[in-house]
Interface confidence: low
């Protein structure tokens, strides 16, 4: 025998208290598939969460984060505090990137400067807390007169010219 509830479309639920009649989902609830025996409660984007998409009878609300925070996790399950460029979020709050690392975004971790010498290249522009180094052409690529760029002396640490 076919399950009578299978005829209930998305946006309704199979109401067992009413002889398995398909009843519309109550306010603030939804069913995204047919044949459901209950409607799911809509997600509420409260506090540091902000509504990106309102809940409908067939789809859940979608949240993002208020300014100063960014989403983490599937479906923006958490909001994490933004930091400034040149910083990363630690358990003690926003901290400046350590020397030799950078972060050009308001989220995420500080990443090491590119080691230009690994590719046989020179450092064209030194790195900062906010920006990676810019690698120049390798000295071998610079035949006399081929470029007006004079590469700086090779750095002892990636991205940092000798003092």
């Amino acid at each position: 025998l076919q399950d009578p509830c299978s005829n209930c479309p998305a946006g309704t639920f199979c109401d067992n208290n009413r002889n398995q009649i398909c009843s519309p989902c109550p306010p603030n609830s939804f069913s995204s598939a047919g044949g459901q025996r209950t409607c799911d409660i809509c997600r509420q984007c409260k506090g540091v969460f902000r509504t990106r998409k309102e809940c409908s009878s067939t789809s859940n609300a979608e949240c993002d984060c208020t300014p100063g925070f960014h989403c983490l996790g599937a479906g923006c399950s958490m909001c994490e505090q933004d930091c400034k460029q040149g910083q990363e979020l630690t358990k003690k709050g926003c901290k400046d990137c350590c020397f030799g690392t950078f972060n050009d975004q308001k989220r995420g971790r500080c990443r090491p400067w590119t080691n230009c010498s690994l590719d046989g290249k020179s450092v064209l522009v030194n790195g900062t807390k906010e920006r990676d180094v810019v690698c120049g052409p390798s000295p071998a690529d610079l035949s006399p007169g081929a470029s007006s760029v004079t590469p700086p002396a090779p750095a002892r640490e990636p991205g940092h010219s000798p003092q």
Epitope: Q44, K46, G47, V48, T66, G68, F69, S77, E80, Q81
Partner: antibody, heavy 117, light 107 residues
Framework: QVQLQESGPGLVKPSETLSITCTVS????????VHWVRQPPGKGLEGLGV???????NYNSALMSRLTISKDNSKSQVSLKMSSLTAADTAMYYC???????????WGQGTTVTVSS | DIQMTQSPSSLSASLGDRVTISCSAS??????LNWYQQKPDGTVKLLIY???TLHSGVPSRFSGSGSGTDFTLTISSLQPEDVATYYC?????????FGGGTKLEIK
């Protein structure tokens, strides 16, 4: 170093309104939320409500009609007001900083409130 | 509201013992659970967040585990300074709610 310090009246009469202030130092109220928690004598912790960096609030549903949480960013102060007090509101009241990743990482020392005539 | 139930409500253990405290949620809360320690003088400190992440400065003898509705706080080797009441707290849904607490004493 981040510190939170609660200050309250100590003794309040039944039916009156309680007003407690949480002063935050070493942290900006525009970057973190503040949650109020209370603990009746000999009992567990009960969350009262939170005020977010942008100023929006969420309250314990059972106490919502009696609670107001507000803040003054320039003074780094958060205030809790609770109306229609009864003896059941006698408790230690704490404020705690809420990080964007949803935990209370710094707590105040608490302020004792006794509701009695 | 989501109800959080802790067990036992109190326990007594010897120094060096392995201690476990349980916390149960009335509905699934994924891993959205924190643990706090309240010392006898009333001071409250965060121990563990997001079920198992140790807060900075918390000794490594503390650990947390679980998912869904059942969670555990473990102290691998009980120390005198661990005498306190321990609370779990869910942040899956507002209002955030605490367990009833587990009072830990030394035998």
């Amino acid at each position: 170093q981040v510190q939170l310090q609660e200050s309250g009246p100590g003794l309040v009469k039944p039916s009156e309104t309680l007003s407690i202030t949480c002063t935050v130092s070493g942290s900006s109220l525009t970057s973190y939320g503040v949650h109020w928690v209370r603990q009746p004598p000999g009992k567990g912790l009960e969350g009262l409500g939170v005020i977010w960096p942008g100023g929006s609030t969420n309250y314990n549903s059972a106490l919502m009609s009696r609670l107001t949480i507000s803040k003054d960013n320039s003074k780094s102060q958060v205030s809790l007001k609770m109306s229609s007090l009864t003896a059941a509101d006698t408790a230690m009241y704490y404020c705690a900083r809420v990080t964007g990743t949803w935990y209370f990482d710094v707590w105040g020392q608490g302020t004792t409130v006794t509701v009695s005539s | 509201d989501i109800q959080m139930t802790q067990s036992p409500s109190s326990l007594s253990a010897s120094l060096g013992d392995r201690v476990t405290i349980s916390c149960s949620a009335s509905q699934g809360i994924s891993n959205y659970l924190n643990w706090y320690q309240q010392k006898p003088d009333g001071t409250v400190k965060l121990l563990i967040y997001y079920t198992s992440t140790l807060h900075s400065g918390v000794p490594s003898r503390f650990s947390g585990s679980g998912s869904g509705t059942d969670f555990t706080l473990t102290i691998s080797s009980l120390q005198p300074e661990d005498v306190a009441t321990y609370y779990c707290q869910q942040y899956s849904k507002l209002p955030w709610t605490f367990g009833g607490g587990t009072k830990l004493e030394i035998k």
